[in-house]
């Protein structure tokens, strides 16, 4: 807290410019206006003051603005944001996609800190979904920012915003996260041909269920095995032999160097050790020749 | 990279004048506070003066106001210390300081850690 002192003759700023870069603490206090420093805010950023003298300025604001600032004010913040609280942010009403940005200009490069969680999070509820030209904006800024989101909150994801989505988005994201954004994506893409499908839907496809791979196997996509090793191991151990080679085109040799690991171990132990040797790959620890399979989910599905 | 660089030092009788000034290279002036400090031997650096990005304020401690006088012309990329009056506790050596960064300092402006570019100095005497 800044002591209440009288501004000295000569130093009442008539305006906010450089010239208070030289002033202390208690002279920014003394001398300058709250209600000069709401209405020239957008000057603050262009004026390289410290730390401590942006302390200054915010406390003329909280006092101005003791319910929390107006978006004129929080459009400007600058570098003045990185002082703010989350418990100032949770006051603030922004609506406008325009602010969004330059607050979260000023973070650039930096992780995601609690007061752009809190902003970010204040300003989609107040839209009440996340619309396409905000998930840009986010992912533009925060690549990782769709995989922060629980299953509950991607449910208010509206197809269309999946257009926005880049393959390095969905890179830390979960199976639940991919349950809930492959429908989505499946229907934003609905309309497209095949080829181009693939390449978009690609990255969702952690999400997929059996039925949908089984589709793609009949569309010569050759999907790679980074992919394939994305996929619901509850998905992939219905394919046959014969889907798999199909879905993997040329990229089914790479299931060598994968048979150790999931969803490629579980699949291989559910399929017939002959067909798995009609791929030619000396894949190991499929079912042994003369084996009797009984599938004891569907026994229990009928009893 | 920036590169700041010194010249008008020397030797000059009490109460004589010395213009002092900072060629900087390799970024433009017109963001930047920029500072003249100090440092006489066995002592620490000391700010003599300092001036905000575009001219229109100017700092000075109590031992220099009135006798010195910083100034700068950011077409040239050149930031001027105008001495007079000078005394032999002005003795030292005079380093011209910048700071580029544009975020926020730590520190304040009248402290070295807020300058980020420095020059290699230049000796300035004050003997009779």
């Known amino acids: 807290e800044v002591e209440k002192t009288a501004c000295p003759s000569g130093k009442k700023a008539r305006e906010i410019d450089e010239s208070l870069i030289f002033y202390k603490k208690w002279e920014l206090e003394a001398c300058v206006d709250a209600a000069l420093l709401a209405t020239q805010m957008d000057r603050v950023n262009a004026i390289p003051f410290t730390y401590e003298q942006l302390d200054v300025l915010k406390h003329k604001l909280d006092e101005l603005y003791p319910q929390g600032y107006p978006e004129s004010v929080i459009q400007h913040l600058g570098y003045l944001f990185l002082k703010m609280s989350p418990e100032d942010i949770r006051k603030w009403n922004v609506t406008s996609l325009e602010t969004l940005k330059a607050l979260l200009e000023v973070n650039k490069g930096h992780e995601m800190s609690p007061q752009v969680a809190t902003l970010i999070d204040r300003f989609v509820k107040g839209r009440g979904q996340l619309d396409k030209d905000t998930l840009d904006t986010l992912t533009a800024f925060y690549p990782g920012y769709l995989c922060s989101l629980s299953p509950e909150e991607l449910s208010s994801v509206p197809p269309s915003s999946i257009w926005a989505v880049r393959p390095q988005d969905l890179d830390t994201c979960d199976p639940r996260q991919l349950d809930v954004l492959y429908p989505k994506a499946r229907l934003a893409f609905q309309n497209m041909n095949g080829s181009e499908y693939f390449v978009k839907i690609q990255s969702f496809l952690g999400g997929a269920p059996t039925e949908d791979l089984k589709a793609l196997s009949q569309q010569n996509v050759s999907m790679d095995l980074a992919t394939f090793m994305k996929l619901r191991t509850d998905a992939v151990l219905p394919l046959t032999v014969a889907e798999v080679q199909k879905l993997l085109g040329p990229h089914v040799e790479g299931l060598k160097a994968e048979e150790r690991h999931r969803p490629v171990r579980d699949w291989i132990l559910r399929q017939r050790q002959d067909d798995l040797d009609t791929l030619g790959l000396g894949l190991q620890g499929g079912i042994p020749n003369g084996y009797l399979v009984l599938d004891l989910s569907m026994q229990e599905a009928l009893s | 990279e920036v590169q700041l660089v010194e010249s008008g030092g020397g030797l000059v009788q009490p109460g004589g004048s010395l213009r002092l000034s900072c060629a900087a290279s390799g970024r433009t002036l017109s963001s930047n506070v920029m500072g003249w400090f100090r440092q006489a031997p066995g002592k620490g650096r000391e700010l003599v003066a300092a001036?905000?990005?575009?001219?229109?304020?100017?700092y000075y401690p109590d031992s220099v106001e009135g006798r010195f006088t910083i100034s700068r012309d950011n077409a040239k990329r050149m930031v001027y210390l105008q001495m007079n009056s000078l005394r032999a506790e002005d003795t030292a050596v005079y380093y011209c300081?910048?700071?580029?960064?544009?975020?926020?300092?730590?520190?304040?402006?009248?402290?070295?850690?807020?300058?980020?570019?420095w020059g290699q100095g230049t000796q300035v005497t004050v003997s009779s």
């Open positions: 300081a910048a700071r580029f960064a544009p975020d926020p300092a730590f520190s304040v402006y009248w402290s070295e850690n807020y300058y980020d570019y």
């Open positions: 001036i905000t990005p575009r001219g229109s304020g100017t």
